[in-house]
Amino acid sequence: SGTTNTVAAYNLTWKSTNFKTILEWEPKPINQVYTVQISTKSGDWKSKCFYTADTECDLTDEIVKDVKQTYLARVFSYPAGHVESTGSTEEPPYENSPEFTPYLETNLGQPTIQSFEQVGTKVNVTVQDEWTLVRRNDTFLSLRDVFGKDLIYTLYYWKSSSSGKKTAKTNTNEFLIDVDKGENYCFSVQAVIPSRRTANRKSTDSPVECMGHEKGESRE
């Protein structure tokens, strides 16, 4: 079983949002298949996505075991129809991925405003806590559980009648802001990990929610 005419994978790229993590690569296979291996710096290689014709592999199950570890993956190329042979000594071509540390590098998914409630001149805005596939003691953890106080939310809020956006911040999932009585306001939130120094510090903005629509309620 040779590895003639197989092309090594290239452009290995981690795509990760809220710890859902997929390794992508090129090229689209012609007469070849791929197997992916992943390991921590000090660990053993574990094979995933055996002999796949896809150019991506979901590695979430592996990286959620310890999101603060640094992982390395590699993609092996085999001829199509390849069957594992115990007698084969020739190592198939492979390419290494960049290192990936989920806690530092996973992108923050778009947040959602769960609700807002007005009481007089105060509005309480609640951000939905997203669930992740990270587990502790067989329980799935939320984004807040994983990041704790490292994660903050920035609230942008503005009168429906004006364009200037005021800001508020919280390291919980709740905001309590002052508003003018009788005015309708709109809200959008952004997740931020201030300790990060890279382009993935911030999420995209949540959808805008405005008072006078179904998510909010008002009490005097």
Epitope: I152, T154, Y156, S163, G164, K165, K166, T167, A168, K169, T170, N171, D178, S188, Q190, V192, P194, R197, T198, A199, R201, K202, T204, D205
Partner: antibody, heavy 120, light 107 residues
Framework: EVQLVESGGGLVQPGGSLRLSCAAS????????IHWVRQAPGKGPEWVGY????????YYADSVKGRFTISADTSKNTAYLQMNSLRAEDTAVYYC?????????????WGQGTLVTVSS | DIQMTQSPSSLSASVGDRVTITCRAS??????VAWYQQKPGKAPKLLIY???FLYSGVPSRFSGSRSGTDFTLTISSLQPEDFATYYC?????????FGQGTKVEIK
């Protein structure tokens, strides 16, 4: 190294316009918030406004609302302050500053400032 | 808008003196107060953030504290390079606002 460099200041007549630039290096402006702050001669700093370059959101001090506009070009990693209908009381050194969007968000880096003089 | 009332507006002190500057917020600003140092012709420099946290690279003779809406900047032993103007700033709500400044001069 994080750096902010303002440019575009100068002498302008009352009612005139000027555009200031704030060129950032060592970080990506779309990951932060950029503020403009001014300081009149012998006075304390006065906040002018901010932009979040990731979404274009802005807010302005009442003293400049309707006359000043903040924008950003993320491809150039630069923020701008367009100043129209300038008045004598707008004379000041104008600084841009970075807001790290932490819980209490101090301005952790400032430019060196550019002087705007409004006089006939 | 939240007013930040800073006092004194100026003070004279000698090298080695303990110097205290205070700032009072017109309403609750939690711990969202920063202190800056400014020298003539230069931009302000961050010293203290979140009321009491020393910014990276700032000498430990600078400290900050909070009591309700009162905030204090203390220089434990004034050094020649500390003669400058100091400003407090709140960033709890938009717009952020600055105190009027305290000029620390040589006695």
């Amino acid at each position: 190294e994080v750096q902010l460099v303002e440019s575009g200041g100068g002498l302008v007549q009352p009612g005139g316009s000027l555009r200031l630039s704030c060129a950032a290096s060592g970080f990506t402006i779309s990951s932060y918030i950029i503020h403009w702050v001014r300081q009149a001669p012998g006075k304390g700093p006065e906040w002018v406004g901010y932009i979040d370059p990731s979404n274009g959101y802005t807010y302005y001090a009442d003293s400049v609302k309707g006359r000043f506009t903040i924008s950003a070009d993320t491809s150039k990693n630069t923020a701008y302050l367009q100043m129209n209908s300038l008045r004598a009381e707008d004379t000041a050194v104008y600084y841009c500053a970075r807001d790290p969007q932490t819980l209490t968000s101090p301005f952790d880096y400032w430019g060196q400032g550019t002087l705007v003089t409004v006089s006939s | 808008d939240i007013q930040m009332t800073q006092s004194p507006s100026s003070l004279s002190a000698s090298v080695g003196d303990r110097v205290t500057i205070t700032c009072r917020a017109s309403q609750d600003v939690n711990t969202a107060v920063a202190w800056y140092q400014q020298k003539p012709g230069k931009a302000p420099k961050l010293l203290i953030y979140s009321a009491s946290f020393l910014y990276s690279g700032v000498p430990s003779r600078f400290s900050g504290s909070r009591s309700g809406t009162d905030f204090t900047l203390t220089i434990s032993s004034l050094q020649p390079e500390d003669f400058a103007t100091y400003y407090c700033q709140q960033h709890y709500t938009t717009p952020p606002t600055f105190g009027q400044g305290t000029k620390v001069e040589i006695k």
